[in-house]
Amino acid sequence: LQDPCSNCPAGTFCDNNRNQICSPCPPNSFSSAGGQRTCDICRQCKGVFRTRKECSSTSNAECDCTPGFHCLGAGCSMCEQDCKQGQELTKKGCKDCCFGTFNDQKRGICRPWTNCSLDGKSVLVNGTKERDVVCGPSPADLSPGASSVTPPAPAREPGHSPQ
């Protein structure tokens, strides 16, 4: 015998209180597959979360973060405070990058400036709290009679991680 519940499509549930007929999901709930005996309650985007995609009878709501915050974790499970470029988030809030480190994004940690000498190059543009150093040609390339220097690549623009 076929399970009568298997005929219930997504967006409905097999209602034991009504002789296993297919009932529509109650408000603010959904079933994304057929044959379900309950509908799942929709995620509520509250607090620092805001609704990115409304719940429907067949799919859950999706959240992102209110301005000044960014998503962390799969499915935007948490919202973390944004900081300015040149800062990182600590337990005590946003703090400026220490000398010798930089952060060119509104999230993440301060990273050490590139050590140009490790690649045998010189510092063309000094680093700041917001930007990495720009390494230029090696000191040997700057000796008299050396071939012309290719202009350095511009410093990276702030990255935008996918949410």
Partner: antibody, heavy 118, light 112 residues
Framework: QVQLQESGPGLVKPSETLSLTCTVS????????WSWIRQPPGKGLEWIGY???????NYNPSLKSRVTISVDTSKNQFSLKLSSVTAADTAVYYC????????????WGQGTLVTVSS | EIVMTQSPLSLPVTPGEPASISCRSS???????????LDWYLQKPGQSPQLLIY???NRASGVPDRFSGSGSGTDFTLKISRVEAEDVGVYYC?????????FGQGTKLEIK
């Protein structure tokens, strides 16, 4: 349908660490939040904390210094550790699926009684 | 944290008669999205709690329609239109607006 099953020692000595595991069957742990809730004998319900499958956690401030919740998606399990237990931690411990990160516990385990005693 | 207060704590009811449980929160549970973030649970003797009502007034799928939730802001009510023997147990309201979610003390419904 989603089912949750708690497992772990029923007796823990004072000052030791309580460790419980919740196994999720009939659905993937890789969505939703997953909570631990406890109920001392004859008393009401207290939320302990939740974890999202990606590892994000949130704990009740009253227990935060003693609680760790972790997840193992490969085993479809999440776990509770509560350190430095006392007799006041004696309770039935429930795991539950949390629809919104601190709201609407739609699916519950059957609960497991943990007694703290020497 | 938000404090939840239920009344009465004990509720003897005759089968077939209606029953009503009150729940009050220490701050409004009405969020800007228009929903009241309040749940009702029933814990039958020897069992885990089960969700009856979410967002103040929405019956969870599979919950008999004799159960209804109402109210807004800080004052909420769970009504059972006709109590049946299987409805005995402890009823809890829970606020789901802020973490930590917090429960009321519980209302024990018993059959007269």
């Amino acid at each position: 349908q989603v089912q949750l099953q708690e497992s772990g020692p029923g007796l823990v000595k004072p000052s030791e660490t309580l460790s419980l595991t919740c196994t999720v069957s009939g659905g993937s742990i890789s969505s939703y939040y997953w909570s631990w809730i406890r109920q001392p004998p004859g008393k009401g319900l207290e939320w302990i904390g939740y974890i999202y499958y990606s590892g994000s956690t949130n704990y009740n401030p009253s227990l935060k210094s003693r609680v760790t919740i972790s997840v193992d998606t490969s085993k479809n399990q999440f776990s509770l550790k509560l350190s430095s237990v006392t007799a006041a931690d004696t309770a039935v411990y429930y795991c539950a699926r949390d629809q919104s990160g601190g709201g609407s516990f739609q699916h519950w385990g059957q609960g497991t009684l943990v007694t703290v005693s020497s | 944290e938000i404090v939840m207060t239920q009344s009465p704590l004990s509720l003897p009811v005759t089968p077939g008669e209606p029953a009503s449980i009150s729940c009050r929160s220490s701050q409004s549970l009405l969020y800007s999205n228009g929903y009241n973030h309040l749940d009702w649970y029933l814990q039958k003797p020897g069992q885990s709690p089960q969700l009856l009502i979410y967002l103040g007034s929405n019956r969870a799928s599979g919950v008999p329609d004799r159960f209804s939730g109402s109210g807004s802001g800080t004052d909420f009510t769970l009504k059972i239109s006709r109590v049946e023997a299987e409805d005995v147990g402890v009823y809890y309201c829970m606020q789901a607006l802020q973490t930590p979610p917090t429960f009321g003390q519980g209302t024990k419904l018993e059959i007269k």
